[in-house]
Amino acid sequence: TVPPMVNVTRSEASEGNITVTCRASSFYPRNIALTWRQDGVSLSHDTQQWGDVLPDGNGTYQTWVATRICRGEEQRFTCYMEHSGNHSTHPVPS
């Protein structure tokens, strides 16, 4: 088992909103759960966009999940990752 490296980034979206993206990379095996949470509760599927789980060329995999949130509410959102029985939570950078 190779645990993922998780990185959260933010980018400007429409006025008053930002897009936050959570990337998991260099993990094996392929199965992973990656989702955005608000106040600890998972967002619905239709408010998130997922990338495919793709090989990254080193025998490991990468994927991402993104969602759009209101600027100023970043602290309410975290990216939750679960892989091979381990989990971690990652905040939006300020």
Partner: antibody, heavy 122, light 112 residues
Framework: QGQMQQSGAELVKPGASVKLSCKTS????????ISWLKQKPGQSLEWIAW????????SYNQKFTAKAQLTVDTSSSTAYMQFSSLTTEDSAIYYC???????????????WGQGTLVTVSA | DVLMTQTPLSLPVSLGDQASLSCRSS???????????LEWYLQKPGQSPKLLIY???NRFSGVPDRFSGSGSGTDFTLKISRVEAEDLGVYYC?????????FGGGTKVEIK
Amino acid sequence: QGQMQQSGAELVKPGASVKLSCKTSGFTFSDNYISWLKQKPGQSLEWIAWIYAGTGGTSYNQKFTAKAQLTVDTSSSTAYMQFSSLTTEDSAIYYCARHDYYGTSGAWFAYWGQGTLVTVSA
Amino acid sequence: DVLMTQTPLSLPVSLGDQASLSCRSSQNIVHINGNTYLEWYLQKPGQSPKLLIYKVSNRFSGVPDRFSGSGSGTDFTLKISRVEAEDLGVYYCFQGSHVPWTFGGGTKVEIK
């Protein structure tokens, strides 16, 4: 389920600050969201704020943003709330409570501390 | 803020009776993830509140099946099918769908 043990009653003067503690045991502290709530005698409850022990991230009820500051000490599995510039309106019982989430399910205040009575009086 | 209004303020009951408590929110309390985070708590004198029902109708662990929750949108109900002495106290509804999270004013269930 675990336990949440809150610090003892406080008698403080107007204008002062008080720091309440909520020591937890029996569960993985860093995986949990912990909220603080206020209840004045004979009244309903108000949610003050939550803190996520894993990152120290917080979200406040705007009514309390200038009044409350939440912190955690993961080494002792303890959550703290500092309440500042106290007035008689802040006299109340303050509770800590642990959220119990499972993805989109779960409960907000599943497990509670016993409460800390804060009395503000000259 | 979402205002949660509970009725009645006081509910006198006889042991063994059915009790029905009402909670109305000032706006729809469906979370952006599609769930309705409406909960019910019971607080007995001198004690911390205890969770009874979460997500409108789900009993929390250890809660007897005489407690049931229902409702949607803005109208919610807690029913106690046969009131026992240990059920007496103040019942609060709570919404966790919109920040700031808010409680109702409470319904006191007492002996008639």
